[in-house]
Interface confidence: medium
């Protein structure tokens, strides 16, 4: 697993709070759950629930914990060594092409297709043609074409305030 960071992930702090634990770097690196001091002499612990680091590192700041969006549920909280794990809430999914937002799962398949896969937090329902068994492209059908299994609206993105 790579420590993927973006500029917004860093949790800057000019100096360590007095209560933060310190230890010495090993070959210039600090253990997971810590970052290095500006002078490179100390390892300073990340703040539980606020920031984290997952690898041996020489980061000047720990990485800022992710906050789950309103359309997500928190599977596990942020610790000093692991970021928050968020998942789309029931009835929505996160697709690879737009991972920044949870989209509503379709409520049914287009005419002439049958459902072979349920809505999960990481995938929409899966539809195949009755005869050929080939998968549907995944595009959202027009409302009038949809054979619904329960009342609902076609897929639409959840708004992310991130």
């Amino acid at each position: 697993e790579s420590a993927l960071i973006t500029q917004q992930d860093l949790a800057p702090q000019q100096r360590a709070a007095p209560q933060q634990k310190r230890s010495s770097p090993s070959e210039g690196l600090c253990p997971p759950g810590h970052h290095i001091s500006e002078d490179g002499r100390d390892c300073i612990s990340c703040k539980y629930g606020q920031d984290y680091s997952t690898h041996w590192n020489d980061l000047l700041f720990c990485l800022r914990c992710t906050r789950c969006d309103s359309g997500e549920v928190e599977l596990s909280p942020c610790t000093t060594t692991r970021n928050t794990v968020c998942q789309c809430e029931e009835g929505t999914f996160r697709e690879e092409d737009s991972p920044e937002m949870c989209r509503k799962c379709r409520t049914g398949c287009p005419r002439g297709m049958v459902k072979v896969g349920d809505c999960t937090p990481w995938s929409d329902i899966e539809c195949v043609h009755k005869e050929s068994g080939t998968k549907h492209s995944g595009e959202v059908p027009a409302v009038e074409e949809t054979v619904t299994s329960s009342p609902g609206t076609p897929a639409s993105p959840c708004s992310l305030s991130g």
Epitope: I5, Q7, E27, G28, L29, E38, H55, D58, L59, L60
Partner: antibody
Framework: QVQLVQSGAEVKKPGASVKISCEGS????????LHWLRQAPGQRLEWMGR????????KYSQNFQGRLSITRDTSATTAYMELSSLRSEDTGVYYC????????????WGRGTLVTVSS | QSVLTQPPSASGTPGQRVTISCSGG????????VSWYQQLPGTAPKLILY???QRPSGVPDRFSGSKSGTSASLAISGLRSEDEALYYC???????????FGGGTKLTVL
């Protein structure tokens, strides 16, 4: 988005001074150190010095000691690099970069400022 | 002033794996971690690895790094034409109290 915007190209005569600016935006300027680097034509990158934008502390390379000054204006979220007693060997591209690791992980760079020293 | 030593050039064919070495001393690589940069002609360097082997966001996992003693190396697997660039290693030098760079390795994709 996070960016560092540097001032434009300069042409100077030997013995003169040059002052280049580097404006940071899209992040908490005071929380990072900004480093200055030079790349002479066809040469390796050379570290010049850095400033802690929060407290103003500076550190300079021995190669530039005495003729390099790095300052910052926190209200303008801008760092400045002034090099004096210019000589032809100082011709090159000067970069500012933001550092987020102790060992020189520079994640955001300015586009560079070309300084030409010629009589 | 001591600096880091890199081979001036390296090459490989698309899909191949290439390795670029970076040799230093006890006061830089021996004591601190290494960063690697990719520089395309006429552009600023771009960080591709930090803390010896960590990739910033957006850098493909084809790029990996390692460090042993006073040497470090950058490996690029599944080589692509867009990887053709100049690669620099860098580290902090405690004796000089400053940053040091390698001379750069020009990678050619044949």
């Amino acid at each position: 988005q996070v960016q560092l915007v540097q001032s434009g190209a300069e042409v100077k005569k030997p013995g003169a001074s040059v002052k280049i600016s580097c404006e940071g935006s899209g992040y908490t300027f005071n929380s990072y150190t900004l480093h200055w680097l030079r790349q002479a034509p066809g040469q390796r990158l050379e570290w010049m010095g850095r400033i802690n934008a929060g407290n103003g502390n500076t550190k300079y390379s021995q190669n530039f000691q005495g003729r390099l000054s790095i300052t910052r204006d926190t209200s303008a979220t801008t760092a400045y690099m002034e090099l004096s007693s210019l000589r032809s060997e100082d011709t090159g591209v000067y970069y500012c970069a933001r550092v987020f690791t102790y060992s020189f992980g520079m994640d955001v760079w300015g586009r560079g400022t070309l300084v030409t020293v010629s009589s | 002033q001591s600096v880091l030593t890199q081979p001036p050039s390296a090459s490989g064919t698309p899909g191949q794996r290439v390795t670029i070495s970076c040799s230093g001393g006890g006061s830089n690589i021996g004591r601190n971690s290494v960063s690697w940069y990719q520089q395309l002609p006429g552009t600023a360097p771009k960080l591709i690895l930090y803390s010896n082997n960590q990739r910033p966001s957006g850098v493909p996992d084809r790029f990996s790094g390692s460090k042993s003693g006073t040497s470090a190396s950058l490996a690029i697997s599944g080589l692509r034409s867009e990887d053709e660039a100049l690669y620099y290693c860098a580290a902090w030098d405690d004796s000089l109290s400053g940053g040091v760079f390698g001379g750069g390795t020009k990678l050619t994709v044949l």
